[in-house]
């Protein structure tokens, strides 16, 4: 039961995380105008990965896409790439993990196959989460650098003849959404990897075989021989029924009447 719960929870957490990564990638508020020096501005600027927006005193908001590809900063392109890779990996991970879920039965898929798929999706979620966290962090670093550069240049332009305040940008809501979403995807991936350990068929139980030595009648029962899975030893107490080992989690479960979206 614990393995199913861990796997299911990992899937749900990753699903929320990937939805968050998609939302963050689409959001326009990656950077927002810093109002510290100009709290009374009637024109509020904010920027996303794909377009920049201006909210005017009328309440009207105008957004313009970045219609150039080559003219954009390399860092912005890198952030876009990281977020897209994160989304793609996460989406593939979700697809794989759906089939890997214990509560969903597909044909005669063996537990070893489900374990491998769970591990694969877990790794994909981990990489997806790391991509999102890296993308958001790179953008945040870019903002911090530009913020202090613009602060240094704020009163040096135009020889002080014109009172013009250079627009500075600070962290937007999308950064926090991205960090949280990346973290959730990462946690979900770790949970999937942990669930994989419980799914793997860790014990091979042989039926009792009698070896007749000359003059002696000794029976050797190597029923408790462990098959290595690479995930350490299993400490569970397992009952042996007719030479086959099955934990509580491995009891055959039939899909309940639910809609899987």
């Amino acid at each position: 039961m614990a393995v199913t719960a861990c796997q299911g929870l990992g899937f749900v957490v990753s699903l929320i995380g990937i939805a968050g990564i998609i939302a963050a990638t689409c959001m326009d508020q990656w950077s927002t105008q810093d109002l510290y020096n100009n709290p009374v501005t009637a024109v509020f600027n904010y920027q996303g990965l794909w377009r920049s927006c201006v909210r005017e005193s009328s309440g009207f908001t105008e957004c313009r896409g970045y219609f150039t590809l080559l003219g954009l900063p390399a860092m912005l392109q890198a952030v876009r790439a990281l977020m897209i890779v994160g989304i793609v990996l996460g989406a593939i991970g979700l697809l794989v993990s759906i089939f890997a879920l214990k509560c969903i039965r597909i044909g005669s898929m063996e537990d070893s196959a489900k374990a491998n798929m769970t591990l694969t999706s877990g790794i994909m979620f981990i990489v997806s989460g790391l991509c999102a966290i890296a993308g958001v962090s790179v953008f945040a670093n870019m903002l911090v650098t530009n913020f202090w550069m613009s602060t240094a240049n704020m009163y040096t332009g135009m020889g002080g003849m014109v009172q013009t305040v250079q627009t500075r940008y600070t962290f937007g809501a999308a950064l926090f959404v991205g960090w949280v979403a990346g973290g959730l995807t990462l946690i979900g991936g770790v949970m999937m990897c942990i669930a994989c350990r419980g799914l793997a068929p860790e014990e091979t139980n042989y039926k009792a075989v009698s070896y007749h030595a000359s003059g002696h009648s000794v029976a050797y029962k190597p029923g408790g021989f462990k098959a290595s899975t690479g995930f350490g030893s299993n400490t569970k107490n397992k009952k042996i029924y007719d030479g086959g080992a099955r934990t509580e989690d491995e009891v055959q479960s039939y899909p309940s009447k639910h809609d899987y979206v």
Partner: antibody, heavy 115, light 113 residues
């Protein structure tokens, strides 16, 4: 078409309050801020502040902040501007305006403060 | 607060002639976010509310005749009427649309010579 229809002229005594209404039609009321502008007889224009019907947010000119209160009722698409503790220099035409670059204006409400 | 200074206070121009009204702001109205200047021009006739002519310093509102044009950047702006018509007699105001409180110029009264 976009229309802003304001309430009728008011005559008030000093120290009293007046509430001017501005009924909007022809556009999504919650999409744009409603601004209020004062014009004293024979004088120029003075911005009082705005109300954002979408979220109830507002911004006031400090000169009016302690006496002006802006509200809105989204169900009737109406914005209100209440001016309290009226003085003789509050005698003016009060306009509501909205749209990009204040493209749409109400016809104005004359408020006369006289003892 | 941003102070808007209009000049001249009044202007008399012959029909068909060019009329030029200037507006100067105490601070730049340029927004680096979209490279636009947030200045508005209005026309007001007696007993009427102001009518929007130009927003963002140079963008003509729909329905405004093309004889009206706006120019300028930063702190200095100009409204030009290329060929004055009788119906253009009015008071013209410029407005800071960049920083709160939104402020208006004192107005320029345009008459026919």
């Amino acid at each position: 078409q976009v229309q802003l229809v304001q309430s009728g002229a008011e005559v008030k005594k000093p120290g009293a309050s007046v509430k001017v209404s501005c009924k909007a039609s022809g556009f999504t009321f919650t999409s744009y801020n409603i601004h209020w502008v004062k014009q004293a007889p024979g004088q120029g224009l003075e911005w009082i502040g705005y109300i954002s019907p979408g979220n109830g947010g507002s911004n006031y000119n400090l000169k009016f902040k302690d006496r002006a209160t802006m509200t809105s009722d989204t169900s009737s698409s109406t914005a209100y501007m209440e001016l309290s503790r009226l003085r003789s220099d509050d005698t003016a035409v009060y306009f509501c305006a909205t749209g990009r670059g204040f493209a749409y204006w109400g016809q104005g409400t004359l408020v006369t403060v006289s003892s | 607060d941003i102070v808007m200074t209009q000049s001249p206070d009044s202007l008399a121009v012959s029909l068909g002639e060019r009329a030029t009204i200037n507006c100067k702001s105490s601070q730049s109205l340029f927004n680096s976010g979209n490279q636009k200047n947030y200045l508005i021009w209005y026309q007001q006739k007696p007993g009427q509310p102001p009518k929007l002519l130009i927003y963002r310093a140079s963008t003509r509102d729909s329905g405004v005749p093309d004889r009206f044009s706006g120019s300028g950047s930063g702190t200095d702006f100009t409204l030009t009427i290329s060929s004055l018509q009788a119906e253009d007699v009015a008071v013209y105001y410029c407005q800071n649309d960049y920083s709160y409180p939104l402020t208006f110029g004192g107005g320029t009264k345009l008459e026919i010579k």
